[in-house]
Protein backbone atom coordinates (compact mmCIF):
# COMPACT_ATOMS: atom_id res chain seq x y z
CA UNK A 1 0.00 0.00 0.00
CA UNK A 2 1.15 3.53 -0.69
CA UNK A 3 1.98 5.82 2.18
CA UNK A 4 1.91 9.51 1.43
CA UNK A 5 5.33 11.02 2.02
CA UNK A 6 5.46 13.35 4.99
CA UNK A 7 7.24 16.11 3.14
CA UNK A 8 4.54 16.05 0.50
CA UNK A 9 1.85 16.09 3.14
CA UNK A 10 2.93 19.30 4.83
CA UNK A 11 4.48 20.76 1.71
CA UNK A 12 3.92 24.49 1.98
CA UNK A 13 0.60 24.06 3.76
CA UNK A 14 -0.95 23.60 0.38
CA UNK A 15 -0.70 25.02 -2.96
CA UNK A 16 -2.25 28.35 -2.75
CA UNK A 17 -3.35 29.28 0.64
CA UNK A 18 0.14 29.92 1.83
CA UNK A 19 0.87 32.97 -0.25
CA UNK A 20 -0.92 35.31 2.06
CA UNK A 21 1.07 34.02 5.03
CA UNK A 22 4.37 34.23 3.22
CA UNK A 23 4.04 37.79 2.00
CA UNK A 24 6.65 39.87 3.77
CA UNK A 25 7.09 43.01 1.70
CA UNK A 26 10.48 44.58 1.94
CA UNK A 27 10.23 46.48 -1.32
CA UNK A 28 11.17 44.92 -4.63
CA UNK A 29 14.27 45.96 -6.51
CA UNK A 30 12.15 46.56 -9.60
CA UNK A 31 8.39 46.88 -9.38
CA UNK A 32 6.69 45.43 -12.45
CA UNK A 33 4.11 47.69 -14.01
CA UNK A 34 0.48 46.49 -14.19
CA UNK A 35 0.70 46.10 -17.98
CA UNK A 36 3.81 43.93 -17.61
CA UNK A 37 2.11 41.80 -14.97
CA UNK A 38 -0.93 41.38 -17.20
CA UNK A 39 1.22 40.37 -20.16
CA UNK A 40 2.97 37.70 -18.08
CA UNK A 41 -0.36 36.38 -16.78
CA UNK A 42 -1.77 36.10 -20.32
CA UNK A 43 1.36 34.24 -21.38
CA UNK A 44 1.09 31.94 -18.37
CA UNK A 45 -2.52 31.17 -19.25
CA UNK A 46 -1.47 29.92 -22.67
CA UNK A 47 1.62 28.12 -21.40
CA UNK A 48 -0.11 26.33 -18.55
CA UNK A 49 -2.80 25.00 -20.89
CA UNK A 50 -0.18 23.80 -23.38
CA UNK A 51 1.85 22.20 -20.61
CA UNK A 52 -1.22 20.33 -19.33
CA UNK A 53 -2.03 19.20 -22.88
CA UNK A 54 1.54 18.01 -23.32
CA UNK A 55 1.39 16.03 -20.11
CA UNK A 56 -1.96 14.50 -21.02
CA UNK A 57 -0.79 13.58 -24.53
CA UNK A 58 -3.04 16.21 -26.12
CA UNK A 59 -6.13 15.16 -24.17
CA UNK A 60 -9.06 17.14 -25.57
CA UNK A 61 -11.74 16.03 -23.13
CA UNK A 62 -13.17 18.44 -20.60
CA UNK A 63 -11.31 18.08 -17.34
CA UNK A 64 -13.25 18.08 -14.11
CA UNK A 65 -12.92 21.43 -12.40
CA UNK A 66 -13.98 22.24 -8.91
CA UNK A 67 -14.73 25.94 -8.51
CA UNK A 68 -13.85 25.99 -4.82
CA UNK A 69 -10.18 25.22 -5.44
CA UNK A 70 -8.01 27.92 -3.85
CA UNK A 71 -7.28 30.95 -5.98
CA UNK A 72 -3.88 31.17 -7.60
CA UNK A 73 -4.08 34.94 -7.31
CA UNK A 74 -3.18 37.05 -4.32
CA UNK A 75 -5.52 39.64 -2.87
CA UNK A 76 -2.49 41.61 -1.70
CA UNK A 77 -3.04 45.36 -2.07
CA UNK A 78 0.55 45.98 -3.17
CA UNK A 79 0.21 43.51 -6.02
CA UNK A 80 -3.43 43.62 -7.12
CA UNK A 81 -4.47 40.81 -9.42
CA UNK A 82 -1.04 39.25 -9.21
CA UNK A 83 -0.34 35.53 -9.27
CA UNK A 84 0.46 34.05 -5.90
CA UNK A 85 3.82 32.93 -7.24
CA UNK A 86 5.50 32.41 -3.87
CA UNK A 87 3.01 29.61 -3.19
CA UNK A 88 3.08 28.13 -6.68
CA UNK A 89 6.81 28.29 -7.46
CA UNK A 90 8.00 25.52 -5.10
CA UNK A 91 5.49 23.12 -6.66
CA UNK A 92 6.53 23.92 -10.20
CA UNK A 93 10.17 23.58 -9.25
CA UNK A 94 9.39 20.17 -7.75
CA UNK A 95 7.56 18.82 -10.79
CA UNK A 96 9.68 20.45 -13.49
CA UNK A 97 12.43 17.76 -13.66
CA UNK A 98 9.77 15.07 -14.18
CA UNK A 99 8.13 17.01 -16.99
CA UNK A 100 11.33 17.39 -18.99
CA UNK A 101 9.65 20.22 -20.84
CA UNK A 102 10.96 23.68 -21.75
CA UNK A 103 7.54 25.18 -21.06
CA UNK A 104 7.75 24.31 -17.38
CA UNK A 105 11.16 25.99 -17.10
CA UNK A 106 9.79 29.07 -18.80
CA UNK A 107 6.77 29.12 -16.48
CA UNK A 108 9.18 29.05 -13.54
CA UNK A 109 11.06 32.01 -15.04
CA UNK A 110 7.84 33.97 -15.44
CA UNK A 111 6.64 33.12 -11.94
CA UNK A 112 10.00 34.24 -10.62
CA UNK A 113 9.42 37.65 -12.21
CA UNK A 114 6.14 37.93 -10.34
CA UNK A 115 7.65 36.84 -7.05
CA UNK A 116 8.09 40.13 -5.18
CA UNK A 117 8.63 38.61 -1.77
CA UNK A 118 11.86 37.94 0.04
CA UNK A 119 10.23 35.13 1.95
CA UNK A 120 12.30 31.96 2.33
CA UNK A 121 11.23 29.34 -0.20
CA UNK A 122 9.83 26.16 1.26
CA UNK A 123 11.04 22.99 -0.43
CA UNK A 124 8.48 20.62 -1.89
CA UNK A 125 9.40 16.98 -2.38
CA UNK A 126 7.98 14.77 -5.07
CA UNK A 127 6.33 11.57 -3.85
CA UNK A 128 8.51 8.50 -4.42
CA UNK A 129 5.67 6.21 -5.54
CA UNK A 130 5.04 6.38 -9.29
CA UNK A 131 1.27 6.61 -9.04
CA UNK A 132 1.51 9.29 -6.36
CA UNK A 133 4.03 11.21 -8.47
CA UNK A 134 1.69 11.18 -11.46
CA UNK A 135 -1.23 12.29 -9.30
CA UNK A 136 0.89 15.03 -7.71
CA UNK A 137 2.04 16.40 -11.09
CA UNK A 138 -1.40 16.27 -12.68
CA UNK A 139 -3.08 17.85 -9.65
CA UNK A 140 -0.73 20.83 -9.83
CA UNK A 141 -0.81 21.21 -13.62
CA UNK A 142 -4.58 20.95 -13.79
CA UNK A 143 -5.11 23.24 -10.84
CA UNK A 144 -2.81 25.92 -12.23
CA UNK A 145 -4.24 25.71 -15.74
CA UNK A 146 -7.85 25.72 -14.53
CA UNK A 147 -7.18 28.54 -12.10
CA UNK A 148 -5.73 30.79 -14.79
CA UNK A 149 -8.36 29.78 -17.32
CA UNK A 150 -11.13 30.44 -14.81
CA UNK A 151 -9.82 33.95 -14.20
CA UNK A 152 -9.66 34.66 -17.92
CA UNK A 153 -13.38 33.95 -18.32
Amino acid sequence: MVSHIGSTRFALFLLCCLGTLMFSHTGPIYQLQPKEIQAIIVELQNLSKKLLDDYLNKEKGVQKFDSDLPSCFTSDSQAPGNINSSAILPYFKAISPSLNNDKSLYIIEQLDKLNFQNAPETEVSMPTDNFERKRFILTILRWFSNCLEHRAQ
Epitope: M1, V2, S3, H4, T8, R9, F10, A11, L14, L15, L56, N57, K58, E59, K60, G61, Q63, K64, D66, L69, P70, N130, F131, K134, R135, F136, L138, T139, I140, R142, W143
Partner: antibody
Framework: QVQLQQPGAELVRPGASVKLSCKAS????????MNWAKQRPGQGLEWIGM????????HYNQVFKDKATLTVDKSSSTAYMQLSSLTSEDSAVYYC???????????WGQGTTLTVSS | DIVMSQSPSSLAVSVGEKVTMSCKSS????????????LAWFQQKPGQSPKLLIY???TRESGVPARFTGSGSGTDFTLTISSVKTEDLAVYYC?????????FGSGTKLEIK
Protein backbone atom coordinates in the same frame (compact mmCIF):
# COMPACT_ATOMS: atom_id res chain seq x y z
CA GLN B 1 -18.77 10.43 -25.77
CA VAL B 2 -16.73 8.16 -23.53
CA GLN B 3 -17.47 4.47 -24.04
CA LEU B 4 -15.97 1.32 -22.57
CA GLN B 5 -17.12 -1.73 -24.51
CA GLN B 6 -16.95 -5.17 -22.92
CA PRO B 7 -18.23 -8.52 -24.20
CA GLY B 8 -21.49 -9.50 -22.52
CA ALA B 9 -20.54 -12.98 -21.37
CA GLU B 10 -17.81 -15.62 -21.32
CA LEU B 11 -18.20 -19.31 -20.46
CA VAL B 12 -15.03 -21.21 -19.54
CA ARG B 13 -14.03 -24.52 -17.98
CA PRO B 14 -12.50 -24.81 -14.50
CA GLY B 15 -8.70 -24.68 -14.58
CA ALA B 16 -8.65 -22.74 -17.84
CA SER B 17 -7.72 -19.08 -18.42
CA VAL B 18 -9.70 -16.27 -20.01
CA LYS B 19 -8.73 -12.87 -21.38
CA LEU B 20 -11.40 -10.21 -20.92
CA SER B 21 -11.31 -7.11 -23.10
CA CYS B 22 -12.37 -3.50 -22.67
CA LYS B 23 -12.30 -1.29 -25.76
CA ALA B 24 -12.15 2.43 -25.00
CA SER B 25 -13.41 5.20 -27.27
CA UNK B 26 -14.36 8.87 -27.05
CA UNK B 27 -11.22 9.99 -25.22
CA UNK B 28 -7.44 9.76 -25.34
CA UNK B 29 -6.78 6.24 -24.09
CA UNK B 30 -3.32 6.96 -22.69
CA UNK B 31 -4.45 9.94 -20.59
CA UNK B 32 -6.44 7.92 -18.04
CA UNK B 33 -5.73 4.83 -15.99
CA MET B 34 -7.96 1.78 -16.42
CA ASN B 35 -9.39 0.03 -13.37
CA TRP B 36 -10.89 -3.44 -13.11
CA ALA B 37 -13.42 -4.57 -10.53
CA LYS B 38 -15.19 -7.82 -9.67
CA GLN B 39 -18.76 -8.32 -8.52
CA ARG B 40 -20.09 -11.73 -7.57
CA PRO B 41 -23.87 -12.30 -7.84
CA GLY B 42 -25.68 -10.35 -5.15
CA GLN B 43 -22.37 -9.12 -3.68
CA GLY B 44 -20.46 -5.84 -3.52
CA LEU B 45 -17.64 -4.49 -5.65
CA GLU B 46 -14.02 -5.57 -5.26
CA TRP B 47 -11.17 -3.57 -6.76
CA ILE B 48 -8.80 -5.81 -8.73
CA GLY B 49 -6.20 -3.37 -9.98
CA MET B 50 -5.36 -0.59 -12.40
CA UNK B 51 -3.03 0.06 -15.31
CA UNK B 52 -1.65 3.25 -16.84
CA UNK B 53 -1.95 2.77 -20.62
CA UNK B 54 0.76 5.35 -21.29
CA UNK B 55 3.55 3.25 -19.76
CA UNK B 56 1.84 0.05 -18.50
CA UNK B 57 2.49 0.81 -14.83
CA UNK B 58 0.27 -1.59 -12.86
CA HIS B 59 -1.00 -1.78 -9.30
CA TYR B 60 -2.87 -4.85 -8.07
CA ASN B 61 -4.99 -5.58 -5.08
CA GLN B 62 -2.83 -8.26 -3.39
CA VAL B 63 -5.87 -10.53 -3.24
CA PHE B 64 -5.84 -10.75 -7.06
CA LYS B 65 -2.07 -10.63 -7.60
CA ASP B 66 -1.82 -14.28 -8.64
CA LYS B 67 -5.18 -14.38 -10.37
CA ALA B 68 -5.27 -11.36 -12.69
CA THR B 69 -2.83 -9.97 -15.27
CA LEU B 70 -3.54 -6.51 -16.70
CA THR B 71 -2.29 -5.41 -20.11
CA VAL B 72 -3.14 -2.80 -22.74
CA ASP B 73 -2.88 -2.47 -26.49
CA LYS B 74 -2.44 1.22 -27.23
CA SER B 75 -2.90 0.78 -30.98
CA SER B 76 -6.47 -0.44 -30.51
CA SER B 77 -7.21 1.50 -27.28
CA THR B 78 -8.06 -1.76 -25.56
CA ALA B 79 -7.38 -2.90 -22.01
CA TYR B 80 -7.22 -6.58 -21.13
CA MET B 81 -7.44 -8.63 -17.99
CA GLN B 82 -6.36 -12.26 -18.06
CA LEU B 83 -7.69 -14.50 -15.30
CA SER B 84 -5.90 -17.79 -14.73
CA SER B 85 -6.58 -21.15 -13.02
CA LEU B 86 -10.28 -20.46 -12.98
CA THR B 87 -12.62 -21.88 -10.36
CA SER B 88 -16.29 -21.36 -9.56
CA GLU B 89 -15.19 -18.58 -7.18
CA ASP B 90 -14.16 -16.57 -10.23
CA SER B 91 -17.69 -16.60 -11.64
CA ALA B 92 -18.71 -12.96 -11.47
CA VAL B 93 -19.30 -9.78 -13.45
CA TYR B 94 -16.01 -8.03 -14.27
CA TYR B 95 -16.04 -4.31 -14.95
CA CYS B 96 -13.45 -2.05 -16.50
CA UNK B 97 -13.63 1.59 -15.45
CA UNK B 98 -11.75 4.73 -16.45
CA UNK B 99 -9.72 6.38 -13.70
CA UNK B 100 -8.97 10.08 -13.58
CA UNK B 101 -6.19 10.03 -10.97
CA UNK B 102 -6.87 13.56 -9.77
CA UNK B 103 -10.55 12.89 -9.13
CA UNK B 104 -12.00 9.38 -9.37
CA UNK B 105 -13.27 6.50 -11.50
CA UNK B 106 -15.71 8.30 -13.77
CA UNK B 107 -16.90 5.88 -16.47
CA TRP B 108 -17.68 2.17 -16.25
CA GLY B 109 -18.04 -0.51 -18.88
CA GLN B 110 -21.22 -2.59 -18.97
CA GLY B 111 -19.37 -5.56 -17.51
CA THR B 112 -18.59 -9.08 -18.70
CA THR B 113 -20.37 -11.94 -16.98
CA LEU B 114 -17.86 -14.74 -16.52
CA THR B 115 -19.24 -18.20 -15.84
CA VAL B 116 -16.81 -20.94 -14.82
CA SER B 117 -18.50 -24.27 -15.27
CA SER B 118 -17.74 -27.76 -16.52
CA ASP C 1 -5.47 -1.48 3.20
CA ILE C 2 -8.04 1.22 3.93
CA VAL C 3 -11.28 -0.32 5.17
CA MET C 4 -14.54 1.33 4.09
CA SER C 5 -17.61 0.76 6.29
CA GLN C 6 -21.08 1.65 5.09
CA SER C 7 -24.29 1.87 7.09
CA PRO C 8 -27.05 0.98 7.09
CA SER C 9 -26.75 -2.08 4.85
CA SER C 10 -30.30 -1.46 3.63
CA LEU C 11 -33.17 0.94 4.19
CA ALA C 12 -36.72 1.27 2.91
CA VAL C 13 -38.25 4.70 2.42
CA SER C 14 -41.29 6.25 0.83
CA VAL C 15 -41.15 8.46 -2.24
CA GLY C 16 -40.43 12.06 -1.25
CA GLU C 17 -38.63 11.18 1.97
CA LYS C 18 -35.11 12.31 2.81
CA VAL C 19 -32.45 9.61 3.00
CA THR C 20 -29.03 9.67 4.61
CA MET C 21 -26.38 6.97 4.39
CA SER C 22 -22.97 6.82 6.00
CA CYS C 23 -19.49 5.80 4.89
CA LYS C 24 -16.51 5.65 7.24
CA SER C 25 -12.88 5.04 6.30
CA SER C 26 -10.19 3.52 8.52
CA UNK C 27 -7.86 6.43 7.76
CA UNK C 28 -8.15 10.00 6.51
CA UNK C 29 -8.85 10.43 2.80
CA UNK C 30 -7.82 14.10 2.73
CA UNK C 31 -5.18 14.77 0.06
CA UNK C 32 -3.05 17.61 1.38
CA UNK C 33 -1.99 19.03 -1.97
CA UNK C 34 -5.44 20.27 -2.98
CA UNK C 35 -7.36 19.71 0.26
CA UNK C 36 -9.74 17.28 -1.41
CA UNK C 37 -11.09 14.09 0.11
CA UNK C 38 -10.59 11.19 -2.30
CA LEU C 39 -14.01 9.68 -1.68
CA ALA C 40 -16.57 8.87 -4.38
CA TRP C 41 -20.17 7.69 -4.30
CA PHE C 42 -21.56 5.34 -6.96
CA GLN C 43 -25.11 4.28 -7.71
CA GLN C 44 -25.75 0.80 -9.07
CA LYS C 45 -29.25 0.08 -10.28
CA PRO C 46 -30.37 -3.56 -10.69
CA GLY C 47 -28.70 -5.20 -13.69
CA GLN C 48 -26.61 -2.13 -14.50
CA SER C 49 -23.00 -1.04 -14.05
CA PRO C 50 -22.14 1.51 -11.35
CA LYS C 51 -22.60 5.19 -12.12
CA LEU C 52 -20.58 8.03 -10.58
CA LEU C 53 -22.67 10.40 -8.46
CA ILE C 54 -20.20 12.30 -6.30
CA TYR C 55 -16.42 12.70 -6.28
CA UNK C 56 -14.08 14.57 -3.92
CA UNK C 57 -16.68 13.73 -1.23
CA UNK C 58 -18.97 16.60 -2.19
CA THR C 59 -18.62 17.47 -5.89
CA ARG C 60 -21.63 16.34 -7.88
CA GLU C 61 -20.80 14.71 -11.20
CA SER C 62 -22.16 16.47 -14.28
CA GLY C 63 -25.76 15.46 -15.00
CA VAL C 64 -26.45 14.10 -11.51
CA PRO C 65 -29.68 15.50 -10.01
CA ALA C 66 -29.29 18.15 -7.29
CA ARG C 67 -31.19 15.96 -4.81
CA PHE C 68 -27.97 13.97 -4.35
CA THR C 69 -25.55 15.64 -1.95
CA GLY C 70 -22.24 14.40 -0.58
CA SER C 71 -20.65 15.74 2.58
CA GLY C 72 -17.99 14.97 5.15
CA SER C 73 -14.23 15.08 5.46
CA GLY C 74 -11.36 13.02 6.79
CA THR C 75 -12.88 9.67 7.75
CA ASP C 76 -16.65 10.32 8.00
CA PHE C 77 -18.78 10.83 4.91
CA THR C 78 -22.48 11.04 4.11
CA LEU C 79 -24.63 10.74 1.01
CA THR C 80 -28.01 12.45 1.26
CA ILE C 81 -30.95 12.16 -1.12
CA SER C 82 -33.21 15.10 -0.28
CA SER C 83 -36.41 13.72 -1.79
CA VAL C 84 -36.33 10.12 -2.94
CA LYS C 85 -37.78 9.17 -6.33
CA THR C 86 -38.72 5.69 -7.50
CA GLU C 87 -35.78 5.66 -9.93
CA ASP C 88 -33.38 5.99 -6.98
CA LEU C 89 -33.92 2.31 -6.12
CA ALA C 90 -30.33 1.06 -6.19
CA VAL C 91 -27.31 0.02 -4.17
CA TYR C 92 -25.03 2.92 -3.24
CA TYR C 93 -21.30 2.33 -2.83
CA CYS C 94 -18.59 4.58 -1.50
CA UNK C 95 -15.01 4.11 -2.69
CA UNK C 96 -11.77 5.60 -1.49
CA UNK C 97 -9.35 6.74 -4.17
CA UNK C 98 -6.77 8.06 -1.73
CA UNK C 99 -4.37 5.17 -2.08
CA UNK C 100 -4.38 1.79 -3.74
CA UNK C 101 -5.95 -0.70 -3.39
CA UNK C 102 -8.98 1.53 -4.01
CA UNK C 103 -11.40 -0.18 -1.65
CA PHE C 104 -15.20 -0.04 -1.79
CA GLY C 105 -17.72 -0.02 1.02
CA SER C 106 -20.09 -3.00 1.19
CA GLY C 107 -22.96 -0.87 -0.11
CA THR C 108 -26.29 0.49 1.10
CA LYS C 109 -29.37 -0.94 -0.59
CA LEU C 110 -32.16 1.59 -1.00
CA GLU C 111 -35.63 0.13 -1.31
CA ILE C 112 -38.83 2.00 -1.99
CA LYS C 113 -41.84 1.32 0.26
Amino acid sequence: QVQLQQPGAELVRPGASVKLSCKASGYTFTSYWMNWAKQRPGQGLEWIGMIDPSDSEIHYNQVFKDKATLTVDKSSSTAYMQLSSLTSEDSAVYYCARQDIVTTVDYWGQGTTLTVSS
Amino acid sequence: DIVMSQSPSSLAVSVGEKVTMSCKSSQSLLYSINQKNHLAWFQQKPGQSPKLLIYWASTRESGVPARFTGSGSGTDFTLTISSVKTEDLAVYYCQQGYTYPFTFGSGTKLEIK
